[in-house]
Interface confidence: low
């Protein structure tokens, strides 16, 4: 009798991390059934013992939020899922080693685009994360990534774009034609960790020039 293949019950056990929200996800294998239950454990790299995650024991959903448990930026983590089918078969699969700093992806920034007659102003709002400092306050992406900067682009027409960038939060594209529509894209860049966020996009129209009416 050949040993059971864990992938029959359980596949693709991995962390999906975005802005330091760390979610463990997995898929059921071909032998998985709706009544298969899953139990989750995690541990810090270098530790011997696994810790059962409260709220993620004998669950039927295929995700578990481990943000709090994996919230130390200086540590590496593992998680594992044990699947148990109604028929009593079980399988356990472990994640690759997880570093939130290395593996988290960046969501688009939160931006306010403001139309003026001959300019468009863009204000980037700080991006909070679930990571907390020692005094309890939530850290922003800027607190964590020291070389983070913003890259802004304004599509003027099919062939011409204007670019701005920097660490500051307020930008303005000047010299624009009144009463004209423009497409703005804003991205977060972190060169040393080779990270780029998905772009925030705003379609804005400069105000009409009332001085001549």
């Amino acid at each position: 009798h050949a040993p059971e293949d864990p992938s029959d019950l359980l596949q693709h056990v991995k962390f999906q991390s975005s802005n330091f929200e760390n979610i463990l996800t997995w898929d059921s294998g071909p032998e998985g059934t709706p009544d298969t239950v899953y139990s989750i454990e995690y541990k810090t790299y270098g530790e011997r013992d696994w810790v059962a995650k409260k709220g993620c024991q004998r669950i039927t959903r295929k995700s578990c939020n481990l943000t709090v448990e994996t919230g130390n930026l200086t540590e590496l983590y593992y998680a594992r899922v044990t699947a148990v089918s109604a028929g009593g078969r079980s399988a356990t699969k472990m994640t690759d080693r997880f570093s939130s700093l290395q593996h988290t992806t960046l969501k688009p920034p939160d931006v306010t685009c403001i139309s003026k007659v001959r300019s468009i102003q863009m204000i980037v709002h700080p991006t909070p994360t679930p990571i907390r400092a020692g005094d309890g306050h939530r850290l922003t992406l800027e607190d964590i990534f020291h070389d983070l900067f913003y890259h802004l682009e304004l599509q003027v027409n099919r062939t011409y774009q204007m670019h701005l960038g920097g660490k500051q939060r307020e930008y303005e594209f000047f010299g624009l034609t009144p009463d004209t529509e423009f497409l703005g894209t804003i991205m977060i860049c972190v060169p040393t960790w080779a990270k780029e966020s998905a772009p925030y996009m705003c379609r804005v129209k400069t105000l009409p020039d009332r001085t001549w009416t």
Partner: antibody
Framework: QVQLVESGGGLVQPGDSLRLSCAAS????????MSWVRQAPGKGPEWVSG????????YYLDSVKGRFTISRDNAKNTLYLQMNNLKPEDTAVYYC????????????????WGKGTLVTVSS | NFMLTQPPSVSGTLGKTVTISCTGT?????????VSWYQQLPGLAPKLLIY???TRSSGTPDRFSGSKSGNTASLTISGLQSEDEADYYC??????????FGGGTHLTVL
């Protein structure tokens, strides 16, 4: 209170190596970006190198890139600077420094300084 | 290695106001609000006075203030006291996480 104590300086010849250490206490070391700053006799300070809280990202002054390596051991609350192929122009007092608070980078200002350790490179 | 430009020396009269300038480029002072000022007394490590252009460090008297215009930052000391006689250094973030200091200014209190 915050204490930073540097050690490992001394007199060496050009081309030699030295390893500086900085023992930190009085604060949560693992939450602080750490830097080395040097000051040559009669000159102004010069930022040399910085290291992210994780130790995974390091920053260097152009003239020391490839020769100096900054590292940290958060379990031992210690910062290191490995200096290879030393040159006479590396002669300076080397300070271990931190920014004003946790999760702040070096460019937020250098609030806490050790007393420094003197490195002399001369033949 | 790049350095910000400061006057080598300035002097001021007891009780009066003095300003020390620090000139950089659009790649440092001009683009970023990460200018710091340090005071150094003989034989001691530098002491942080001002960071983020105009934020006073804990323990810095409110006689010290910082400002920035274009590529130039300034430290203003009002109500000069004899203990203010020292070397003053500016510093700024520079693109790609470098941090550059000025050459220093010696303040003499007359």
């Amino acid at each position: 209170q915050v204490q930073l104590v540097e050690s490992g300086g001394g007199l060496v010849q050009p081309g030699d190596s030295l390893r500086l250490s900085c023992a930190a206490s009085g604060f949560t070391f693992g939450s602080y970006f750490m830097s080395w700053v040097r000051q040559a006799p009669g000159k102004g300070p010069e930022w040399v190198s910085g290291i992210h809280i994780s130790g995974g990202i390091t920053y260097y002054l152009d003239s020391v890139k490839g020769r100096f390596t900054i590292s940290r051991d958060n379990a031992k609350n210690t910062l290191y600077l490995q200096m290879n192929n030393l040159k006479p122009e590396d002669t300076a007092v080397y300070y271990c420094v931190t920014p004003p608070g946790p999760f702040k980078a070096h460019y937020n200002g250098m609030k806490y300084w050790g007393k420094g350790t003197l490195v002399t490179v001369s033949s | 290695n790049f350095m910000l430009t400061q006057p080598p020396s300035v002097s001021g009269t007891l009780g009066k106001t003095v300003t020390i300038s620090c000139t950089g480029t659009s790649r440092d002072i001009g683009d970023y609000n990460y200018v710091s000022w340090y005071q150094q007394l003989p034989g001691l490590a530098p002491k942080l006075l001002i960071y983020k252009v105009n934020t006073r460090s804990s323990g810095t008297p409110d006689r010290f203030s910082g400002s920035k215009s274009g590529n130039t930052a300034s430290l203003t000391i009002s109500g000069l006291q004899s203990e203010d006689e020292a070397d003053y250094y500016c510093a700024s973030y520079r693109l790609y996480a470098d941090y550059v200091f000025g050459g220093g200014t010696h303040l003499t209190v007359l």
